[in-house]
Amino acid sequence: ARARNGDHCPLGPGRCCRLHTVRASLEDLGWADWVLSPREVQVTMCIGACPSQFRAANMHAQIKTSLHRLKPDTVPAPCCVPASYNPMVLIQKTRTGVSLQTYDDLLAKDCHCI
């Protein structure tokens, strides 16, 4: 039977793949030399374990989980990665002054295991 994309974390609350927010300054990110604003970013990222069939993104992730159980030294467990992103606009330094630039893959919106 096809495995279910489970949302129940068998490792306990907050231990499995989910969205985390980390407050970071431009200095923390190494952006201070090219970004002017915002000076602080609420960075959303995907962190956590990917146990059996938890938020499996696709059949490949399900297969990976099964094979990892059989051959943990050969096949790694699925990884927790963004399923989609929220866009963000930055005010950047340019040679002639400042400009706006949008980035569509900077902040995770939700997470899955792949």
């Epitope: 915002p38 000076r39 602080e40 929220n86 866009p87 963000m88 606009v89 005010i91 919106k109």
Partner: antibody, heavy 119, light 110 residues
Amino acid sequence: EVQLVQSGAEVKKPGESLKISCKGSGYSFTSYWIGWVRQMPGKGLEWMGVIDPGGSYTIYSPSFQGQVTISADKSISTAYLQWSSLKASDTAMYYCARYGRYGTYFDYWGQGTLVTVSS
Amino acid sequence: QSVLTQPPSVSGAPGQRVTISCSGSSSNIGVLYVNWYQQLPGTAPKLLIYSNDNRPSGVPDRFSGSKSGTSASLAITGLQAEDEADYYCQSWDSSSNYVFGGGTKLTVLG
């Protein structure tokens, strides 16, 4: 409660100068950008420019570059839009709006300031 | 001429479902996001949908947004008299930064 309160309606003659204001309250004024949007009578919305009140960085729409000046005074949580020489075609409703945290949309709007320029 | 194209008007009877389209290009909607605003008569615009399909708190779930390719849509189900307003889509364009559609006037019939 987040609020943007704009200054009152203005009636001016062509060639006169004008500065309208937008006072933010209920949030950290320097943590969010402020944009200005024009709406001419019976028309749609046009983005004019943006200011980061914390660093006073400003960026203008190409259509409004050199026509207006956007500024802010963070000590009184107020953003400004000004003209040095008004034209009849500047007659419009002007809105200030706060950007959402990631700078992609406007999450709160002022009530608008109607500017009428007529001889 | 707006970078984003919307129909000038749409209408529907109370209780019906209506959709408003917003057509762009590969330099705006095609690669990025769409936001929607509602402007009731004589008032300031209000954020209705952000980042294609997210509703701010307080916006009824009768309003929903979607995006496909270089077009986006706003759907309103269970149309109510108080939905009569102008609706604007907004995105980002590489040449002119923040851009709005020309606006769509929604009329609730009857």
